[in-house]
Amino acid sequence: SAPGEDEECGRVRDFVAKLANNTHQHVFDDLRGSVSLSWVGDSTGVILVLTTFHVPLVIMTFGQSKLYRSEDYGKNFKDITDLINNTFIRTEFGMAIGPENSGKVVLTAEVSGGSRGGRIFRSSDFAKNFVQTDLPFHPLTQMMYSPQNSDYLLALSTENGLWVSKNFGGKWEEIHKAVCLAKWGSDNTIFFTTYANGSCKADLGALELWRTSDLGKSFKTIGVKIYSFGLGGRFLFASVMADKDTTRRIHVSTDQGDTWSMAQLPSVGQEQFYSILAANDDMVFMHVDEPGDTGFGTIFTSDDRGIVYSKSLDRHLYTTTGGETDFTNVTSLRGVYITSVLSEDNSIQTMITFDQGGRWTHLRKPENSECDATAKNKNECSLHIHASYSISQKLNVPMAPLSEPNAVGIVIAHGSVGDAISVMVPDVYISDDGGYSWTKMLEGPHYYTILDSGGIIVAIEHSSRPINVIKFSTDEGQCWQTYTFTRDPIYFTGLASEPGARSMNISIWGFTESFLTSQWVSYTIDFKDILERNCEEKDYTIWLAHSTDPEDYEDGCILGYKEQFLRLRKSSVCQNGRDYVVTKQPSICLCSLEDFLCDFGYYRPENDSKCVEQPELKGHDLEFCLYGREEHLTTNGYRKIPGDKCQGGVNPVREVKDLKKKCTSNFLSPEKQNSKSN
C-alpha cells in the first residue's frame, strides 16, 4: 500500500472528536434527480444548490426544481424556492454567477411553449433576494457577464440575435441579428461572428467577424471569410478560409482586430482543427490537428506577438474538434504543463514540460514503485497520468489532475507506472515539487481535493458501494487518517470545496436510498480544529523551485529567473489561513541560448540549443508581413522567449526594419474592413 495509508500516523491527536463536533449533515427534502452547486463570491460562505427532478409523462415532461442557500460554507441550508416563485429552473443554463465578488446571480427559468420570451431571476445580493424578469427573447445560451462590469450581460437568442443588457438584465436590447458566436473581450468590447446567407453552419468559412466597443451603438467589421475565432490572453485569433481552396489559416491580432498578422502555422483542411490549449499575456500554446482521422496533432508555442511559432510537441493526443485532450496547466508551479502523446504503436504516454513547452520529457518513475505489464524493461519506465481522455474512455478515473496556485509545488493525479497509460485500475500519485518527482499517495482510484492552501488534502475512495469514510492528510499526502463521517453509508456523488483551495470546509454529496425513496444529503466537515493554531515563521522552510543541480550556478532558472518559496513543513500541523499569501523571492538569471526561441526562418535541430537557418530560406532576405506593412528582418536567429526575464549573458542581435511597403496579411486586409454605426 502507499506509504502511511494503513499506518497510525500519530500526527493529529483526538481528531475523531474534533471532526465529529464539526460535521454537519443536511438532508434535502427532494426526490433524487440532478443537483448542481455554485459558490457565490469569494470567502462569503454562500452556496446555492439547485435540485431538479424530471417526471416523463406520456405527452410532456413534468419538472420540479428547488433552490437552497447556505451562508456558512454548506453546514446549513435554507430552502429559498419561494424566492423564485417555485419556478422550474433550466439546468442546462446552470446558475450564472457574476465575476469577482459582485454577488450577482442569474437563473434561467423554463417557460411554457408559445410564450413571447424566456424568464430569468436576478439577484445582486448574494441570492438573498431575487427579481423576476421576463425576456423579449428565448435564450440559447447562458447569460454572459462582462469581466469588467457585472451589470453588462450578453446572450444569444434561439433566433440567433445578439442581446445586451446594461442594467444587469433588467432591460434588454437586440444589437445584431444573424449572430453565431459572441464573446466579451477586454474593456467591455464584444466580438461576434455573423452570417449573411442561410445559417451559421451553412456560412461556416464565410462568416464575418465584428466588434463593438460601445455595447452596440457602433460596429466594425474586423474580419471576413471567418471560420471561427477565439480569445486567449491578449491575443485575438481568427481561422480564415483561403481564397483558392478549402484550407484555412490562423490570423492573430493584438490590438482588438484593428490589424492582423498571419500566424506562421500550418494551414488546415476541412476535417482538421486548431485549438488554443493555453494562453496568457505573454504567449499561446496552439494545437494544430494532423490531416486524416489520426487523433493527434502538433503543439506549437508562440512568440510574444503570437506570430512566430516553434514546434513544441509532436503526436499530441487530441481526438476531434471539441474532443478530448489531456493538456493540463500545472498551476502550482510556473512553466509546467502535462499532456499525452499517441505513440507509433497507438499507446498513450504522458509528457511534461517545465519550461513552458521548450522541452518535453517523460515523468520520472516514482521511487519504490514497480513497472507494470506495459513496460518492456521492468527497471526502466515512467509515470503516466490519467486525464480527460481516460475519463472520456470510461476508465476507472474519477478525477483529472489537480493543482492549485496557492498550494505551491503540489500536483495530484491518477496514474500508472509503465511504458504507457494502462487500462488497469490506477493509483493516486502526488508530486510536491511541481512534477519533477512523484510518490504513490493512495492505492486505487479516489476523489481528492486540497484545503487550506495545501495544509490538508482530503480524499474519498471511488467505489460503487455506499461509503461513510473520508481520508485526510496534513503532510502533503505522506500519512493518512480515516474518519467515519456517518453511521449510515451514502451513495457518493461528489466532493465540493470552495474554489481557490483556501477553505477548511469540505462537503461530501450523495444520496440515501431506501425502499421507496432516495434523497440528496450533504455532509460538511470543517477541519479548523484539526489545524488548531495559526502557522508561524518556524513552520515554513525554504524551497527552490525547478532545482535539479545545486552545484549549477543557474540551478532553478526557468524562463530567465529562479524563485525561492517559503513552503509549509510537512511536519507542521497548523493553519495557513484564508489570508495566506504565497511568499516567493525571485532572482534574475543570466541569459543563455535556452532563453531564446528560434526566429522566423530558423529552427532548432534536435538536441541542439543553437538555431540554424531553414535550408529553403538560406540566402533569401527575410521579409514578412506584419500589421499590414512589409518588414525586413535582420536576425541571427533568436528571439527572447515570451515572459523570459533573463539579463546579461548571451545576447543575440535582432533588428526589424519597416520596409514602408504596404502588404496584405493574406485575407484580413485593412482595406476590406469597414465600420458602421447604429
Epitope: 515539487d433 525547478h546 540551478d555 510537512k570 511536519s571
Partner: antibody, heavy 124, light 107 residues
Framework: QVQLVQSGAEVKKPGASVKVSCKAS????????MHWVRQAPGQGLEWMGW????????MYAQKFQGRVTMTRDTSISTAYMELSRLRSDDTAVYYC?????????????????WGQGTTVTVSS | DIQMTQSPSSLSASVGDRVTITCRAS??????LNWYQQKPGKAPKLLIY???SLQSGVPSRFSGSGSGTDFTLTISSLQPEDFATYYC?????????FGGGTKVEIK
C-alpha cells in the same frame, strides 16, 4: 573535492566564549545549509542548529537559544559557530556538516559532508 | 522534541553476518530518517537518507526501510570495515534529533 575544514582545538574557561570556523571548498557554498553538531566525550550526537549561507538565516535548537550564534562570510566561503557563557558540560567535539539537498529542499535529507571536528575543552 | 530510540545499543557479529538495527521515533516522522556510521576519532558519515535512499559512494550491502515511526538499517553481509557505531537521525521536525547509537563489535 568537496570538503569542510574546521579551525583548531580550543581550551576555554567557564563563562568565556568560543568561535569555531568551518571553511568550505569544492562546492557552491551558498547552495547548502550548514549545520553544527556536537559530541561530548563518549556520548552521542547532538544537533545545535543551522545557518543558511545564502541569506544568513538561522535555526537553533531550543537548548542553545540565546547562547549560540551562527554566521557566515560568503566572500571566503566560511561558516562560524560562536557559543557563549561556556560551561564544563560544553566540552565536546564540534562538527560543521553540510545539509544534503533534494530537488529544491534544503532540509530533511541529512548531512552529507562533515568537517574533521574541533575539540573544545571547557575547564577552570 | 522527538525522541529517537535505537536498539540494540550494542551488538556483536561476525564478518558475513546479516545485521539489523532498528530505530523508533516517538511520533511519526514520515520518511525523514537518516542513518550515519561513525568510527572512533572520525566524523560521522551519511549512509542512508530519506529512510531508504542510499547515499552515493556507500556500498549496496547497506539498506534502509520504514516509514512513520519504525525504521530499520540492514547490513546484508558484514565486512571488517563495517565495525563502527551507527546513528539514526530524524530531520522532520526541529530540533533535529539523533538516536543513542548502536555499537557493532566483532564477535
Amino acid at each position: 573535492q568537496v570538503q569542510l575544514v574546521q579551525s583548531g582545538a580550543e581550551v576555554k574557561k567557564p563563562g568565556a566564549s568560543v568561535k569555531v570556523s568551518c571553511k568550505a571548498s569544492g562546492y557552491t557554498f551558498t547552495a547548502y545549509y550548514m549545520h553544527w553538531v556536537r559530541q561530548a566525550p563518549g556520548q552521542g550526537l547532538e544537533w545545535m542548529g543551522w545557518v543558511n549561507p545564502n541569506s544568513g538565516g538561522t535555526m537553533y535548537a531550543q537548548k542553545f537559544q540565546g547562547r549560540v550564534t551562527m554566521t557566515r562570510d560568503t566572500s571566503i566561503s566560511t561558516a562560524y559557530m560562536e557559543l557563549s557563557r561556556l560551561r564544563s558540560d560544553d566540552t565536546a567535539v564540534y562538527y560543521c556538516a553540510r545539509g544534503k539537498r533534494s530537488s529544491g529542499w534544503y532540509e530533511g535529507y541529512g548531512m552529507d559532508v562533515w568537517g574533521q571536528g574541533t575539540t573544545v575543552t571547557v575547564s577552570s | 522534541d522527538i525522541q529517537m530510540t535505537q536498539s540494540p545499543s550494542s551488538l556483536s557479529a561476525s564478518v558475513g553476518d546479516r545485521v539489523t538495527i532498528t530505530c523508533r521515533a516517538s511520533q511519526s516522522i514520515s520518511s525523514y530518517l537518516n542513518w550515519y556510521q561513525q568510527k572512533p576519532g572520525k566524523a560521522p558519515k551519511l549512509l542512508i537518507y530519506a529512510a531508504s535512499s542510499l547515499q552515493s559512494g556507500v556500498p549496496s550491502r547497506f539498506s534502509g526501510s520504514g516509514s512513520g515511526t519504525d525504521f530499520t538499517l540492514t547490513i546484508s553481509s558484514l565486512q571488517p570495515e563495517d565495525f563502527a557505531t551507527y546513528y539514526c537521525q530524524q530531520s522532520d521536525v526541529s530540533p533535529i534529533t539523533f538516536g543513542g547509537g548502536t555499537k557493532v563489535e566483532i564477535k
